[in-house]
């Protein structure tokens, strides 16, 4: 039967009674080896003869003394079998054995749960020699026990390669319940059931669980650990914890907040990072995510011109990186811009609207109906055109750039003229006779030079020829311009 000692029991003696050879308990040991910082097996004395190997926990010596008396079997004496104590208390237990003096090289080691204890354990071995035998007491002490000290402790002694093993001493460290699983914070959908788990262990067992929601007990009666609470749904944030009870008392888990997922708050601080003629780069600060990650965002763009039809352009983008380049905008236009973001629950309201403007751009179309004719009397080339549609000027017209290329007998030279925005005609001097003049015109704004018109060619004859009909750009869709003579 296992002997059980509770922590409140009186200290038990180091060994049950006098050792063989009438060794008294008040004898001082001949040799005492404390091992405070690492256990080393004790050395025994030189024997006169070796013992015969024997398997098992008891070694039966076959050697006889001078008087030819048979030696008793070697075994550790019985000691307390089960020690129960509270965390942080001190404990001391021991193994004792009487070994005939004929044996040498005897070692004692402590083992816990099948592993030898070699570290910083407080083990002391004391020797009480007598005429024929030496009593050995191996003590093991722990000053402040922890749960990790729970286990089965044994002593082992080696005599001439023979191993003697003591009965186990079970150390049971009891304390308040210890959580192995606590509820975790969660973000949940409104009115949707979810689970929380709580698990705690002793010893002592059993451990019982009470769930607490917003300071009220959920279960009126304890539930065995582990316990899973199915919360039937929440309409507002709640705080949960669990209480673990055992015979030593109560441990309360951390309180965890369960949040209800909601639509996000609208983004804030929408700002213009950069504007061009046809695009605006915006950034924003996301609002509160409603306890659910943002999925994407929507940029809404309205023309701020009171005469516009009020239609809204919508651009969808990923939630990160809180930046978006709005493209395909008109130059020199005013826009209202708002941002909305969504999570799994739905869309936020739109951010406060901000006003933004595109800059002037280079015109997007060339001047129309370009006509070129030779005025031989003044030795000039007259050029006429129609200015591009206002919407496609992409800014305020500041003038035109005329490119005229003169080609004659393998020689080619290009000249550029700038003209003011007021007229829609220009006159350029003939540079070379008996040559072809190719004319192209582009509109110019502060935003840059627009595309050049399709080339219009006119042949400039040698002096003395008659005037020629004008050349002009064809109607849209026609082939290349043709010189009309």
């Amino acid at each position: 039967a296992i002997t059980e000692a509770r922590e409140e029991a009186k200290p038990y003696p180091l060994f049950p009674g006098p050792f063989p050879g009438s060794l008294q308990t008040d004898h001082t040991p001949l040799l005492s080896l404390p091992h405070a910082s690492g256990y080393q097996p004790a050395l025994m004395f030189s024997p006169t003869q070796p013992g015969r190997p024997h398997t098992g926990n008891v070694a039966i010596p076959q050697v006889t003394s001078v008087e030819s008396k048979p030696l008793p079997p070697l075994a550790f004496k019985h000691t307390v079998g089960h020690i129960i104590l509270s965390e942080h208390k001190g404990v001391k237990f021991n193994c004792s054995i009487s070994v005939p003096n004929i044996y040498q090289d005897t070692t004692i080691s402590w083992w816990k749960d099948g592993k030898e204890l070699l570290g910083a354990h407080h083990a002391i071995t004391q020797f009480y020699p007598d005429d024929e035998v030496t009593a050995i007491i191996a003590s093991f002490s722990i000053t402040s026990v922890q749960r990790s000290d729970n286990g089965s402790y044994i002593c082992k002694m080696k005599i001439n390669n023979e191993e003697i093993v003591s009965d186990p001493i079970y150390i049971e460290v009891q304390g308040l319940p210890h959580f192995t699983k606590q509820p975790e914070s969660m973000n949940v959908t409104r009115n949707t059931a979810f689970n929380l788990t709580c698990q705690a262990v002793g010893p002592p067992e059993p451990v019982n669980i009470f769930w607490v929601q917003n300071s009220s007990r959920v279960n009126e009666q304890p539930e065995k650990s582990p316990s899973v609470l199915t919360v039937p749904g929440l309409t507002e944030m709640a705080v949960f914890s669990c209480e673990a009870h055992n015979d030593k008392g109560l441990t309360v888990s951390k309180g965890v907040q369960i949040n209800i997922k909601a639509i996000p708050s609208p983004p804030t601080e929408v700002s213009i990072r950069n504007s061009t003629a046809h695009s605006i780069l915006i950034s924003w600060v996301p609002g509160f995510d409603g306890y659910s990650p943002f999925r994407n965002c929507s940029i809404q763009v309205k023309e701020a011109d009171p005469l516009s039809n009020g239609s809204v352009m919508i651009f969808n983008t990923s939630a990160l990186p809180h930046l978006y380049q709005i493209k395909q905008l008109q130059a020199l236009a005013n826009y209202s811009i708002g941002v909305s973001c969504m999570n799994e629950i739905g869309w936020s309201a739109v951010s406060p609207w901000i006003l933004a403007s595109t800059t002037e751009g280079a015109p997007s179309v060339a001047p129309l109906n370009v006509t070129v004719f030779l005025n031989e009397s003044s030795d000039n080339v007259d050029i006429r055109w129609m200015k591009p549609p206002t919407k496609q000027q992409d800014g305020e017209l500041v003038g035109y750039r005329i490119s005229h290329v003169w080609q004659s007998a393998g020689i080619s030279k290009e000249l550029l003229e700038e003209v003011g925005q007021n007229g829609s005609r220009a006159r350029i001097s003939v540079q070379v006779h008996n040559a072809t003049c190719t004319v192209r015109i582009a509109a110019v704004t502060r935003g840059g030079v627009g595309p050049f018109s399709d080339p219009v060619k006119i042949f400039i004859p040698a002096h003395g020829w008659v005037d020629y009909a004008p050349s002009s750009t064809p109607a849209p869709g026609n082939a290349d311009p043709v010189l009309i003579i």
Epitope: N191, W211, Q213, N214, S216, V218, N219, E220, Q221, P222, E223, L229, P232, G233, T235, A238
Partner: antibody, heavy 118, light 106 residues
Framework: QVQLVQSGSELKKPGASVKVSCKAS????????VHWVRQAPGQGLEWMGW????????TYAQGFTGRFVFSLDTSVSTAYLQISSLKAEDTAVYYC???????????WGQGTLVTVSS | EIVLTQSPATLSLSPGERATLSCRAS?????MHWYQQKPGQAPRPLIY???NLASGIPARFSGSGSGTSYTLTISSLEPEDFAVYYC?????????FGGGTKVEIK
């Protein structure tokens, strides 16, 4: 299946005592509390309190202290309601109910009519 | 203690009509349970924790609400639904019941 079976109707004189039983079956008795609910003739439900079947500790609602006693015999999975010094106003149907999480009474006894009349 | 006030006290409706029963709490409560009682019978669990149907309860019954205001709805009354309905709160002791709403045939 879970069942709560209550003892039969009682006719008592004022000043007498009565003990109503509620026998549980189909579940582990000590895992759930037992609530007691009173319903006077033509009236609504009135919560009287409950008894913890794990510890035996009773909890009484206001107005049900003193003459009312909740008790248990866990060996036969039975809860009891004893009323002493009976008065005419104690005439009612008394129900026992199993207490689940969130104080939800998920199974009810059939009720016991206690009539107090001289 | 939390006082539960049910309204109306009596609701006169015809089969097939929609019934809406209200239960108001004197202070905020996390969940409301609902029970149905017919004459001479024990109360029968109907809705657990505001909106969860008890075992065997048909889907025409539904519950909603939060804080101090809770509702039991019967989408289309069947003849067997004419009974008294009680709400009961969970949050604080004592575990009070409402005074009941009687749903009767018009």
């Amino acid at each position: 299946q879970v069942q709560l079976v209550q003892s039969g109707s009682e006719l008592k004189k004022p000043g007498a005592s009565v003990k109503v039983s509620c026998k549980a079956s189909g579940y582990t008795f000590t895992n759930y509390g037992v609530h007691w609910v009173r319903q006077a003739p033509g009236q609504g439900l009135e919560w009287m309190g409950w008894i913890n079947t794990y510890t035996g500790e009773p909890t009484y609602a206001q107005g049900f202290t003193g003459r009312f006693v909740f008790s248990l015999d866990t060996s036969v999975s039975t809860a009891y309601l004893q009323i002493s010094s009976l008065k005419a106003e104690d005439t009612a149907v008394y129900y026992c109910a199993r207490g689940y999480r969130y104080a939800y009474m998920d199974y009810w006894g059939q009720g016991t009519l206690v009539t107090v009349s001289s | 203690e939390i006082v539960l006030t049910q309204s109306p006290a009596t609701l006169s409706l015809s089969p097939g009509e929609r019934a809406t029963l209200s239960c108001r709490a004197s202070s905020s409560t996390s969940y409301m349970h609902w029970y149905q009682q017919k004459p001479g019978q024990a109360p029968r669990p109907l809705i657990y924790a505001t909106s969860n149907l008890a075992s065997g309860i048909p889907a025409r019954f539904s519950g909603s609400g939060s804080g101090t205001s809770y509702t039991l709805t019967i989408s289309s009354l069947e003849p067997e639904d004419f009974a008294v309905y009680y709400c009961q709160q969970w949050s604080s002791n004592p575990r009070t019941f409402g005074g009941g709403t009687k749903v009767e045939i018009k």
